[in-house]
């Protein structure tokens, strides 16, 4: 355990005034795993003045950080960069004169308690005023700052000229692009203090490069991948006070591909499972032994899960017999192209034949049995992928 602190498997606490700690507590090698620490409590540590960039990074599981009644004066910008689990920060009654929102912008904090710090009235802490104004009343804190006359002023009354939230505006073309093509987005930002502009492209797969010049920025996306369809691209303007963003959704059109087609499985119904990708939504057509398969209430396509441009479903068959054994071909088609895949399905052996011992019994002897059955009908119901009640369950995308 760090000197002058006590530890459990998930907690570190350093609360004794003397001799106290002069640096943020670090676990010794071969002691408790820092990743398991969820809470650090520091109190009465007047000689603890700084949290350095790498002091907290080992505590990746940290949820609660409390440093109260201590001497904290400075927190490095990247101090909490690796602590994405942090939810509660309490820096009550320390010596902080300034604190940037850059410390916390990547965190999903439930609490940030900062009362009793000698903040200097400046644009640097205007973000705290903005934060307070967006909080519901029970959560508000009595925050003060020292003005030029060294008088305590409520943060709620703070007025700093040329110190406001920035703005971002995207000038985007219609972001519906064909796979393999390129597109350029333009963004302009404004505000005082002058904001920085950056692009948030999330997990964009396609190659992209940006150029930024003062208040203007462009993002060029080349050889666009179908994997990026539905992804959001944001232009972000950020300054001391806060940030603004403007976003667009990327839609990529591409030819269908059948990524999965398997032999039938039996559950409540028989199912020939498939997965099809394509945008716009492909039309599906089944073929049985090379001829169009006309769907009916006994044999029909069901889509169970829709994941943006990917469709998981089944050709569902009610009580198929040996009459339905054969080759099934799925064709998926949209305006950009088509794809087809085939599987052989065997549902059951013929009557009077021990199929276990005669698996290759010549089907030609039974041609007279291939007249239409109640499983099919003569109407061609080929159409776009039908939506079903199964696809309407919660947690499904459409």
């Amino acid at each position: 355990c760090p000197t002058s602190c006590k530890c459990s498997s998930a907690r570190i606490w350093c609360t004794e005034p003397s001799p106290g700690i002069v640096a943020f507590p670090r676990l010794e090698p071969n002691s408790v795993d820092p990743e398991n620490i969820t809470e650090i409590l520091i109190a009465n540590q007047k000689r603890l003045e700084i949290i350095n960039e790498d002091d907290v990074e080992a505590y990746v599981g940290l949820r609660n950080l409390t440093i109260v009644d201590s001497g904290l004066k400075f927190v490095a910008y990247k101090a909490f960069l690796k602590n994405s689990n942090l939810r509660h920060i309490n820096f009550t009654r320390n010596k902080l004169t300034s604190l940037s929102r850059r410390h916390f912008r990547h965190l999903d904090l439930s609490d940030l308690i900062l009362t009793g710090n000698p903040f200097t009235c400046s644009c640097d802490i205007m973000w705290l005023k903005t934060l307070q104004e967006t909080k519901s009343s029970p959560d508000t804190q009595d925050l003060y700052c020292l003005n030029e006359s060294s008088k305590n002023m409520p943060l709620a009354n703070l007025q700093i000229p040329n110190c406001g939230l920035p703005s971002a505006r995207l000038a985007a073309p219609n972001l519906t692009v064909e796979e393999g093509k390129s597109v350029t987005l333009s963004c302009s930002v404004g505000g005082d203090p002058l904001p920085t502009l950056y692009w948030d492209v999330g997990n964009l797969v396609s190659k992209h490069m940006n150029e930024t010049s003062h208040t203007q920025g462009s993002l060029r996306i080349t050889n666009i991948s179908s994997d990026d369809s539905g992804k959001q691209i944001s232009c972000v303007a950020e300054n001391l006070v806060g940030e603004d963003q403007d976003s667009v959704n990327l839609t990529v059109h591409f030819a269908p591909t059948i990524t999965f087609l398997e032999s039938p499985t039996s559950d409540h119904h028989w199912c020939i499972p498939f997965t099809v990708r394509g945008n716009p939504k492909p039309a599906l057509q089944w073929f049985y032994n090379g001829a169009i398969l006309n769907e009916s209430k006994y044999i029909c396509t069901k889509i169970h899960v829709t994941n943006h441009t990917e469709y998981h479903g089944c050709l569902q068959l009610d009580n198929p017999t040996h009459m339905n054994n054969g080759d099934y071909t799925l064709m998926a088609k949209n305006e950009y192209g088509k794809d087809e895949r085939q599987i052989s399905a065997h549902f059951m052996g013929r009557p009077g034949v021990d199929y276990e011992t005669n698996p290759n019994y010549p089907e030609v002897l039974y041609e007279d049995w291939t007249t239409p059955t109640d499983i099919g009908d003569t109407t061609n119901k080929s159409n776009e992928i039908p939506s079903t009640d199964v696809a309407d369950q919660s947690n499904r995308e459409h």
């Epitope: 006590k6 606490w13 005034p17 003397s18 001799p19 007047k46 000689r47």
Partner: antibody, heavy 116, light 106 residues
């Protein structure tokens, strides 16, 4: 070396005020907590409270809250314990304690006698 | 405020081991210091942070703390160790002393 030098013994009447002192030397006075401890005749030790001279942050034990005031003057490296109205039950030896390694340095004690 | 309980007195023969206990609720979660006080003298810190010895304190003084009990052990007790011993811990940033144990070396 680190030393804490306390003011001389005091004899007072009930209702009078009093301020005793403790002067630190040989270490960075402002950077370490200083505590005051009471020992009544024939009894054990009791924490009165502690002060951090650099910012005058003061903590009192519950039984002494509102009864005494602890203060510090960093310019002369001195901390004080004062009463606005003494009682006979305040008769005791009062020690100050500080140091870089816990409270490892103690003053010699100031005997306060309150008697009518 | 928490209460620290010590035995009022303990007698030990020279060169024997003396163990003075100090008990309190979840005391192991706090740091315990031990002070020695001889008649007419100021207290002297002999153990701090459960187990640490300040410079100048003989090795025969040692400390431990877990659960609800802290212990000061004096191995090979000498006549000069006869004194009152006080345990001390911090509770909500104020100090708390035990009632003290009078150690008599027979």
């Amino acid at each position: 070396q680190v030393q804490l030098l306390q003011s001389a013994a005091e004899v007072k009447k009930p209702g009078e005020s009093l301020k005793i002192s403790c002067k630190g030397s040989g270490y960075r006075f402002t950077s370490y907590w200083i505590g005051w401890v009471r020992q009544m005749p024939g009894k054990g030790l009791e924490w009165v409270g502690i002060i951090y001279p650099d910012d005058s942050d003061t903590r009192y034990s519950p039984s002494f809250q509102g009864q005494v005031t602890i203060s510090a003057d960093t310019s002369i490296s001195t901390t004080y314990l004062q009463w606005s109205s003494l009682k006979a039950s305040d008769t005791a030896i009062y020690y100050c304690a500080s140091g870089e390694v816990a409270f490892d340095v103690w003053g010699q004690g100031t005997t306060v006698t309150v008697s009518s | 405020q928490s209460v620290l309980t010590q035995p009022p007195s303990l007698s030990v023969s020279p060169r024997q081991t003396a163990s003075i206990t100090c008990s309190g609720d979840k005391l192991g979660d706090k740091f315990v210091s031990w002070y020695q006080q001889k008649p007419g003298q100021s207290p002297v810190l002999v153990i701090y942070q459960d187990t640490k010895r300040p410079s100048g304190i003989p090795e025969r003084f040692s400390g431990s703390n877990s659960g609800n009990t802290a212990t000061l052990t004096i191995s090979g007790t000498q006549a000069m160790d006869e004194a009152d011993y006080y345990c001390q811990a911090w509770d909500s940033s104020t100090g708390v002393f035990g009632g003290g144990t009078k150690l008599t070396v027979l």
